[in-house]
């Protein structure tokens, strides 16, 4: 896939550094595990934002109103926080794509088998729409073999 980061898109990199993509990862993992109905206990639970206002004064409140409907009690909090984060990429579709690629990459180790990987990818593609945001066109979510530092 094309490596925009090598072209020096510093503004996007800054956005990605400040974003907290964990709620998105947690929401999606919960969703596919719920759909599979094969996990007894969900290991994810609401947690402190690693970039919470107390640690980073310039961070916005992750619980501010968001433009989508709440669905599914278990991960609605994660979804709301996730949508707040993705909303920051609304005006930069290439950066939105990179955020989605980052979520995919972060979770790739955890996905068990091709089927779960495809399901995660499907849910990830739908995520911007679920948040009432535009989905980026032509966003490659394939994770190449070779690990996280292949760049």
């Amino acid at each position: 896939r094309q490596q925009w980061e090598l072209q020096g898109d510093r503004r996007c990199q800054s956005q990605l550094e400040r974003a907290n993509l964990r709620p998105c990862e947690q929401h999606l993992m919960q969703k596919i595990q719920r759909d599979e109905d094969s996990y007894g206990r969900d290991p994810y639970s609401p947690s402190q934002d690693p970039y919470s206002p107390s640690q980073d004064p310039d961070r916005r409140d992750p619980y501010s109103p968001s433009p989508y409907d709440r669905r599914g009690a278990g991960s609605s909090q994660h979804q709301e926080r996730c949508c707040n984060e993705l909303n920051e990429f609304e005006n930069n579709q290439r950066c939105m794509c990179e955020a989605l690629q980052q979520i995919m990459e972060n979770q790739s180790d955890r996905l068990q088998g091709r089927q779960q990987e495809q399901q995660f990818k499907r849910e990830l593609r739908n995520l911007p729409q679920q948040c009432g945001l535009r989905a980026p066109q032509r966003c490659d979510l394939e994770v190449e073999s070779g690990g996280r530092d292949r760049y």
Epitope: N20, D56, D149
Partner: antibody
Framework: VQLVESGGGLVQPGGSLRLSCTAS????????MSWVRQAPGKGLEWVSS????????KYTDSVKGRFTISRDNSKTTVYLQMKSLRAEDTAFYFC???????????????WGQGTLVTVSS | TQSPSSLSASVGDRVTITCQAS??????LSWYQQIPGKAPKLLIS???FLQAGVPSRFSGSGSGTDFTFTITNLQPEDVATYYC?????????FGGGTKVEIR
């Protein structure tokens, strides 16, 4: 992936020292980097982290105001400027790479071999 | 809080180390191995996910505040100090370490 620390040595209490960590084998500018220290015979202590752009920095309370983390992406090097050094800062200082690009939110997947800082009169 | 601080076991034994967090860290916990005189090495991330190339005799489990690290079939090359580390928030904190020796 290779991380090589340098700049350690003997310094008097109240003195200053600048540690460097030069990286190779990965796209340095998109990964967060950290410093972790280990007093001789003791456990590991996280000291500081910096994001790829250098815009986000974090410090453990005991070094705030005394240590400054910075990076030069053109030289693929991260620095730790240490001032007002105390005896309790004596330790091996390791630099470590974030496992995941962009964010300071995941574990360290590669570490350097460390450089010894001794603060003594 | 990591315990025990040290342990001695025989080759082939099963060794268990625990790590207790002071607050809920979901599964944002890693385990590192530090062989004397060497840099730490990441073995497990996200509480239970083994890093590529790490032998399957190492395993981790837990979520919330209670975590366990296990070595099944202890080998002489496993002599090291093992550390847990939370990365849920800053400051990132390490457990006190567990020194594993062969008796």
């Amino acid at each position: 992936v290779q991380l090589v620390e340098s700049g350690g040595g003997l310094v008097q209490p109240g003195g200053s020292l600048r540690l460097s960590c030069t990286a190779s084998g990965f796209t340095f500018s998109i990964f967060g980097m950290s410093w972790v220290r280990q007093a001789p015979g003791k456990g590991l202590e996280w000291v500081s982290s910096i994001s790829g752009t250098g815009e986000i920095t974090k410090y453990t309370d005991s070094v705030k105001g005394r240590f400054t983390i910075s990076r030069d992406n053109s030289k693929t090097t991260v620095y730790l400027q240490m001032k007002s050094l105390r005896a309790e800062d004596t330790a091996f200082y390791f630099c470590a790479k974030e496992r995941t690009k962009y964010q300071l939110a995941y574990p360290f997947d590669y570490w350097g071999q460390g450089t010894l800082v001794t603060v003594s009169s | 809080t990591q315990s025990p601080s040290s342990l001695s076991a025989s080759v082939g034994d099963r060794v268990t180390i625990t790590c207790q967090a002071s607050q809920d860290i979901t599964t944002y916990l890693s385990w590192y191995q530090q062989i004397p005189g060497k840099a730490p090495k990441l073995l497990i991330s996200d509480a239970s996910f083994l890093q590529a190339g790490v032998p399957s005799r190492f395993s981790g489990s837990g979520s919330g505040t209670d975590f366990t690290f296990t070595i099944t079939n202890l080998q002489p090359e496993d002599v090291a100090t093992y550390y847990c580390q939370q990365y849920e928030n800053f400051p990132r904190t390490f457990g006190g370490g567990t020194k594993v020796e062969i008796r």
